[in-house]
Interface confidence: low
């Protein structure tokens, strides 16, 4: 008939596999258990996918690579304590005192419980990585943590390459045996340990337990190094960058650890599964019971086939391994699960140009020199639509595009962003808003959804944010509806009037020119050029103030531009900012200050655009330690990757704005990335491409 | 310093109209606009309109029938007036003026009006 | 129009005592909202633009939060000379609108 196998990764749980099946038996529990003798989890898991075995015990992290490499899903749950469930919080915790947050853990003493532990390594490490507070270039996580934070305790790091700086708070038993071992003897190992080690003043920052400040504070611990100690002198360090008391876990923690669950294969039962078991808990999970499930001192061990802790277990309903694991703890695990052994040795980067490849080789020869990995390698391609072909073809790896770009990349091709360029705060050319401004002083005020009819004033055809952010935003939103695709001369016909200058007037609506003005002397109306005084941003924001349209669609930094001074000219000599306000898509307006929350769409920065299959945080730690290297325009080292000059031409792999490379954070979809109007208004244009 | 000083009636019969002059000093009425607010026990504070450096106005739509708002920058001053008051018009009114990027940063000091026979 | 509700209507609180007023919106209003106190007799008094930015020459223990529809006006340590009336103002639409106040007095 039916039987379950289970694995067992030890002699010992071999052992108490063979007893339990034996006490099912024995009991009449249906369908029959038995085991399997796996060397290792991950082993296990391959038995598990390969028929050979049905199921087994894992914990987080475990869960993650069995759902994410093997299709393997969690049925049931463990519980430990009736206050959190399925469920404990990994917490960072730093003296009341400090001022230490989130954002400046870089250089901070660190304690953790041990190497590879869940809540004192794994989360905390992979949730820096992940949100790109830590970089790791070549999956080297342990150099990455040893040279991020200021020295630390992690017990069990001794046996490695940076024992120097990862044990190097950590002191040992009384007689300082034992330094740095992943054993008692290590005063500062395990989660008191860690917490030991922030309190007496070692460290300044523990990754431990959301009960770990609770349990051994406030008279509640016997060593006389706790005693002393108040729950209240310590804090707990938000994800928001903000700080909470030590009883707010629920809200302040860097991840929801998940209890460990029983996985399957996808094909199996996962009902049948919970009955067998919950039929064993029932008869054995309490005191005097011939077999005891959850204990494990009769075979000399801890946690043999399910936690000692565990009160009982739970059929899982969502079965799949994202869903147990919860966003937190799954986005720490992508930040820290980087196999060396799978990383390519190469990084291709596509390349557009004579000059650009003279750059990019280049860069490979700075970046081998300094041993940066994963090397990079040059491919040239056509265009950026060739390059996306060719990462799609897995040809190439990665390539950095602008917003249009990279909206094509994302949608057509499925590439994702894997690190962004940064421009200077006061640098507006590169990363903007556009917005749609209009005189405060109209006694017949209107909104954005009232603009049909009225006057407008355009920097010029196809211009970011004058013409293809706004003209796309109100055909997304209904305003504007072209007929066979034909939007010029829709927006034609929703405008009143117009000035819309153009290089190229074939064919072109006559009311799209009418409000323009041409030069001093009357010439060259319309013109897509500087002839033309309403052309450009600030020429589109004069239409607007004398009074030729109602609505000027410029960029955010237009009107302080161009008023309380800062443009001498005189039609702009009196103006000021003020006097103006912006429409927003809310139906609101606002005051031109106002620009960030009321604007049509934000121009994106650049991206690196990679296949969804490659790491992310290995092509921006590769990024990050040549930026430090390479990334200032005046460093000594042989190589500027932010400057072009050398080669006779701009923007060469990077924009030459860049001030330096930044990780994508939440933004891990071309959509997160380019920001929602952005992609509503390329969509209202790209719906009309017939 | 800036200073928003008002003058006008405090007793006005129903159905008459109301007028109250704002005259500002500190500042130019060409470069900001004055807004008037009431305050009345029933209604609390209620903006009622403004008019703007340029002489345009824009008014509460609840008042917009019985409301006009002009001004003489020569003089530095603002006229408020308001038709057909009944007894619930009664308020303090007050004329306010922004402050750059401050909503309401200065005030007049508020003229009681009492609507009675 | 937006409606600004304001909770509680009344607080009574002895002075040192630490207070936080609060303001709800009808709809999101981003951070347009303002905060002014009255006291007897006299004009409002502009305490805290833009939900969250001070105003030169208030008091540092007047602070304001809040972004969309809910926020709050804090007082550290209230002083005697705190209580009066205070009400919150959008500017995020027009007509522009008050709250109906919340009123702090002395326990």
């Known amino acids: 008939g039916m039987e379950v196998r289970w694995c067992a990764t030890s002699d010992p749980e071999q052992h108490k596999c063979g007893n339990m099946s034996e006490a099912f038996r024995e009991a009449g529990i249906q369908p029959s258990l038995l085991c399997v003798r796996g060397t290792s989890a991950d082993h296990c898991v391959q038995l598990i996918a390969a028929q050979e075995a049905d199921a087994i015990t894992l914990d987080g992290g475990a869960i993650y690579e069995a759902g994410k490499e093997h299709g393997l899903k969690p049925v049931v749950g463990e519980v430990y304590d009736q206050e959190v469930g399925t469920s404990y919080y990994a917490v960072a915790v730093v003296r009341r005192s400090s001022h230490v947050t989130i954002d400046t853990l870089k250089g901070v003493k660190s304690c953790h419980t041990g190497i590879n532990r869940t809540v004192g390594w794994n989360v905390p490490v992979g949730y820096l990585v992940e949100s790109g507070r830590l970089s790791v270039m070549g999956c080297d996580v342990l150099k990455a943590v040893s040279d991020y934070f200021g020295g630390s305790c992690v017990p069990g790091a001794g046996e490695t390459s940076y024992s120097e700086s990862l044990c190097r708070l950590c002191r040992g038993d009384s007689s300082g045996e034992g330094v740095c071992d992943k054993s008692p003897l290590e005063r500062y190992y395990d989660y008191s340990g860690a917490f030991r080690c922030l309190a007496e003043g070692a460290g300044d920052v523990a990754f431990v337990k959301h009960s770990t400040v609770l349990e051994n504070t406030d008279g509640k611990t016997l060593p006389s190094w706790g005693q002393a100690l108040l729950s209240q002198d310590f804090e707990l360090l938000c994800r928001d960058g903000s700080r909470a008391d030590v009883t707010e876990w629920r809200q302040c923690h860097l991840a929801r650890v998940p209890a460990h669950a029983v996985v399957v294969r996808a094909d199996t039962d996962g009902g049948l599964i919970f009955r067998l078991l919950n039929e064993g808990q029932r008869l054995f999970s309490h005191e005097g019971s011939s077999f005891q499930m959850f204990s494990s001192e009769a075979y000399g061990q801890k946690d043999l086939l399910f936690k000692d802790s565990t009160s009982e277990l739970v059929p899982i309903a969502t079965q799949t391994y994202e869903a147990w694991l919860g966003h937190e703890y799954l986005h720490a695990m992508k930040g820290l699960l980087c196999d060396p052994n799978r990383l390519p040795p190469y990084l291709r980067w596509c390349v557009l140009s004579t000059p650009e490849i003279q750059k990019c080789g280049d860069m490979a020869v700075a970046f081998r020199r300094q041993r940066l990995k994963p090397e990079i390698q040059c491919v040239s391609a056509k265009s950026p639509q060739h390059c996306m072909e060719r990462i799609q073809a897995e040809q190439v790896d990665a390539v950095t595009l602008s917003g249009e770009d990279i909206y094509t990349a994302g949608k057509t091709y499925g590439l994702v962003p894997a690190a962004g360029e940064h421009y200077a705060p006061e640098d507006s050319s590169n990363s903007y808003y556009v917005v749609a401004v209009v005189r405060r002083d109209s006694s017949h005020a209107f909104t954005l959804d009232e603009l049909r009819g009225k006057r407008s004033c355009h920097a010029g055809f196809g211009s970011p944010a004058g013409w293809d952010v706004p003209v796309g935003a109100l055909i997304q939103r209904g305003f504007i509806r072209p007929k066979d695709c034909d939007v010029l001369t829709a927006v034609s016909e929703f405008f009143n009037a117009s000035c819309v200058p153009v290089n190229n007037p074939k064919n072109y609506p006559s009311s799209l020119c009418a409000l323009c003005v041409g030069d001093e002397q009357g010439r060259n109306k319309c013109v897509g050029n500087s002839q033309e005084r309403y052309y450009g941003y600030r020429g589109a924001f004069r239409c607007l103030v004398e009074n030729a349209g109602d609505v000027a669609f410029v960029r955010h930094t237009t009107v302080f531009d161009n008023t309380n001074g800062h443009n001498s000219e005189p039609w702009a000599a009196e103006l000021r900012s003020e006097d103006y306000e912006l429409l927003c898509p809310n139906g609101a307006r606002a005051e031109v200050s106002q620009f960030a929350a009321c604007n049509l769409a934000q121009i994106p920065p650049h991206a690196v655009m990679v296949r969804p299959d490659t790491n992310i945080f290995t092509v921006y730690g590769l990024l990050d330690k040549a930026q430090d290297l390479f990334g200032d325009d005046h460093n000594k080292n042989g190589f500027k990757m932010f400057d072009s000059s050398n080669y006779h031409g701009q923007d060469l792999l990077f924009k030459d704005a860049t001030v330096r490379a930044v990780p994508v954070g939440e933004k891990t979809t071309y959509r997160g990335w380019l920001g929602l109007d952005y992609v509503a208004a390329l969509e209202g244009m790209s719906s009309q491409q017939c | 310093q800036v200073q928003l000083k008002q003058s006008g009636p405090g007793l006005v019969q129903p159905s008459q109209s109301l007028s109250i002059t704002c005259t500002v000093s500190?500042?130019?009425?060409?470069?900001?606009?004055v807004h008037w607010v009431r305050q009345s026990p029933g209604k609390g504070l209620e903006w009622l309109g403004v008019?703007?450096?340029?002489?345009?106005?824009d008014y509460n739509a609840a008042f917009i029938s019985r409301l006009s708002i002009s001004k003489d920058n020569s003089k530095s001053q603002v006229f408020f007036k308001m038709n057909s008051l009944q007894a619930d018009d009664t308020a303090i009114y007050y004329c306010?003026?922004?402050?750059?990027?401050?909503?309401?940063?200065?005030w007049g000091q508020g003229t009681l009006v009492t609507v009675s026979a | 129009d937006i409606v600004l509700t304001q909770s509680p209507a009344t607080l009574s609180v002895t002075p040192g005592d630490s207070v936080s007023l609060s303001c709800r919106a009808s709809?999101?209003?981003?951070?347009?909202l303002h905060w002014y106190q009255q006291k007897s007799h006299e004009s409002p008094r502009l305490l805290i633009k833009?939900?969250?930015q001070s105003i030169s020459g208030i008091p540092s223990r007047f602070s304001g939060s809040g972004s969309g529809t809910d926020f709050a006006l804090s007082i550290n340590s209230v002083e005697t000379e705190d209580f009066g009336m205070f009400f919150c103002?959008?500017?995020?639409?027009?007509?522009?609108?008050f709250g109906a106040g919340t009123k702090l007095e002395l326990k």
């Open positions: 833009y939900a969250s």
């Open positions: 709809q999101g209003i981003s951070n347009n």
């Open positions: 500190g500042f130019s009425l060409s470069s900001y606009g």
């Open positions: 008019i703007w450096s340029g002489g345009n106005t």
């Open positions: 103002q959008q500017s995020n639409s027009w007509p522009l609108t």
């Open positions: 306010a003026r922004r402050n750059n990027s401050a909503w309401f940063a200065y």
